[in-house]
């Protein structure tokens, strides 16, 4: 068997660090057997069998000119093997961040904080940190570890499925190369890293007969699990075309009626979502949707507010892709104290 331990990486390659002493090992001989060393393609003897170093070649203060292929020969001139030297650095701790688009799963991504120049792989795992008794400062030994399954195709990402919203997790990402390993530990709680995807299906419609009104409606992001326990709240922004500043409102449900639109101008509208108990952060904004208030006249009969309101108050359906959030306040009225002013303006 070879006297040379096989480092992780391609066979026949040995590794060292620039500026450091490097030992190359002749793979096809018995440990301690004296050998001669040559650079591949060069007749000059680098180190003879009488060096006292046996099957090893020592390169003091290796640099990039030392990289390449070496040949070792036994005393009788037989080929002891070929070795390729590659120089690089031990791993540094990778940079890791984790994010969650819902309350059941989270993903972690990583990048090397320093390029080693050597073949590199990553080991990813996690533990659940559990609390002992009422004293939340005392923690029991962590449960796990379990592997954090990595994305196929070499994407630097792993996903934890079926996480518990109230638990804390310790993520372990270890960078491994032939010169060593280096680990970054990251403590995460789903509550703090939760950032929903933006709401979907944003539509902006005029309200016939009301030149200063727009009705915006949207749905929950498809990635948000369909259970009524964890709801989203929303933030809506709107502005007339060519106007630099956004106006912001926090709607009570999955629609909002804007009552101070600028008559005749197209308006941009966008929405963002957040856990309704303020866990984590607001989502990115949805793509903008555009709408222009109606220019038509008032309908002859103004329907009662209950008839105008198109979204009945229903309990979230488990099979519904976008469960409406039970209102914490009444839906915005489509007719309010400003209606008479608006009607006069229309009729004038």
């Amino acid at each position: 068997s070879s006297p040379c331990p096989q480092a992780w990486g391609p066979p026949g390659v040995q590794y060292g660090q620039p500026g450091r002493s490097v030992k190359l090992c002749c793979p096809g001989v018995t440990a301690g057997d004296p050998v001669s060393w040559f650079r591949d393609g060069e007749p000059k003897l680098l180190q003879g069998p009488d060096s006292g170093l046996g099957h090893e070649l020592v390169l003091a203060q290796a640099d990039s000119t030392d990289e390449g292929t070496y040949i070792c020969q036994t005393l009788d001139g037989a080929l002891g093997g070929t070795v390729t030297l590659q120089l690089g650095y031990p791993p540094a701790r990778p940079v890791v961040s984790c994010q969650a688009a819902d309350y059941e799963n989270f993903s972690c991504t990583w990048s090397p904080s320093q390029i080693s120049g050597l073949p590199t792989r990553y080991l990813t795992s996690y533990r659940k940190k559990t609390v002992l008794g009422a004293d939340s400062q005392r923690r029991s030994p962590s449960t796990g570890p379990w592997p954090c399954p990595q994305d196929p195709l070499g994407a630097a990402r792993c996903v934890v499925h079926g996480a518990e919203f109230w638990s804390q997790y310790r993520i372990n990402v270890t960078e491994v190369n032939p010169l060593g390993a280096s680990t970054r530990l990251l403590d995460v709680s789903l509550q703090s890293i939760l950032r929903p995807d933006p709401p979907q299906g944003l539509r902006v419609e005029s309200v016939p007969g009301y030149p200063r009104r727009l009705r915006a409606s949207w749905t929950y992001p498809a990635s948000w699990p369909c259970q009524p326990h964890f709801l989203l709240k929303f933030r809506l922004q709107y502005r007339p075309a060519q106007h630099p500043a956004w106006s912001t409102v926090e709607p009570a449900g999955l629609e909002e009626v804007i009552t101070d639109a600028v008559a005749g101008l197209p308006h941009a509208v966008r929405v963002s979502a957040r856990d309704f108990l303020d866990a984590g952060t607001w989502s990115t904004w949805s793509p903008e949707a555009w709408g222009t208030p109606s220019t038509g006249t008032i309908p002859k009969e103004i329907p009662a507010w209950g008839q105008l309101h198109t979204q009945p108050e229903v309990e979230p359906q488990v099979d519904s892709p976008a469960p409406p959030r039970p209102s914490l306040q009444p839906h915005p009225r489509l007719l309010d104290h400003r209606d008479s002013v608006e009607q006069v303006a229309v009729l004038a």
Partner: antibody, heavy 118, light 107 residues
Framework: EVQLLESGGGLVQPGGSLRLSCAAS????????MTWVRQAPGKGLEWVSS????????QYADSVKGRFTISRDNSKNTLYLQMNSLRAEDTAVYYC???????????WGRGTLVTVSS | DIQMTQSPSSLSASVGDRVTITCQAS??????LNWYQQKPGKAPKLLIY???NLQTGVPSRFSGSGSGTDFTFTISSLQPEDIATYYC?????????FGPGTKVDIK
């Protein structure tokens, strides 16, 4: 020679913007994370932001999050800090630094002074 | 964020004296602690990394020790050129933080 050289500092009004640059030489810039650290006059050191070699991960101090953007151009061996919505408390000497393992700063530039004042 | 405290905030000592500065982290940072020297008008210089390792080219009179939350930096024999401010800094997490500094001068 291994060195870092900052530029782009100067006097700017509150609410204004400035872009700092850091030119690196003497080492393989694209292999290393890079960092900005600042020091207000007569005060201590404050880490501002860091970026990994690929540019794919960035990290910011809470005091600058949402206002400052760190970036890099590995083909030009240059690190940048775009500073928007500047405040009086951003007045400082800004140092570019090369860390080992993200946070061990073994190489520093000479710094560039940013003054935010009306 | 992890808070770093240093003591004393300043000290005066005679040439040849042994000088000790302590640094405390608000939580366990393993040995991810560095010490820097900064002279007036100059950039900081790394002296000690990972709590106790001497950076290449730094005189052996500088040393560091500690692990977890409590760390010590020592100048075994103070020299006139050591007049400077010394900072500890943690990098256990992705947001490195510095101590407030200790100003050292000669009596």
């Amino acid at each position: 020679e291994v060195q870092l050289l900052e530029s782009g500092g100067g006097l700017v009004q509150p609410g204004g913007s400035l872009r700092l640059s850091c030119a690196a030489s003497g080492f393989t810039f694209s292999w290393y994370s890079m960092t900005w650290v600042r020091q207000a006059p007569g005060k201590g050191l404050e880490w501002v932001s860091s970026i990994v070699p690929s540019g794919g991960h960035t990290q910011y101090a809470d005091s600058v999050k949402g206002r400052f953007t760190i970036s890099r151009d590995n083909s030009k061996n240059t690190l940048y800090l775009q500073m928007n919505s500047l405040r009086a408390e951003d007045t400082a000497v800004y140092y570019c630094a090369k860390p080992e393992d993200w946070g061990m700063f073994d190489l520093w530039g000479r710094g560039t002074l940013v003054t935010v004042s009306s | 964020d992890i808070q770093m405290t240093q003591s004393p905030s300043s000290l005066s000592a005679s040439v040849g004296d042994r000088v000790t500065i302590t640094c405390q982290a608000s939580q366990d940072i393993n040995n991810y602690l560095n010490w820097y020297q900064q002279k007036p008008g100059k950039a900081p210089k790394l002296l000690i990394y990972d709590a106790s390792n001497l950076q290449t080219g730094v005189p052996s009179r500088f040393s560091g020790s500690g692990s977890g939350t409590d760390f010590t930096f020592t100048i075994s024999s103070l020299q006139p050129e050591d007049i400077a401010t010394y900072y500890c800094q943690q990098y256990d997490n992705l947001s490195p933080t510095f101590g407030p500094g200790t100003k050292v001068d000669i009596k």
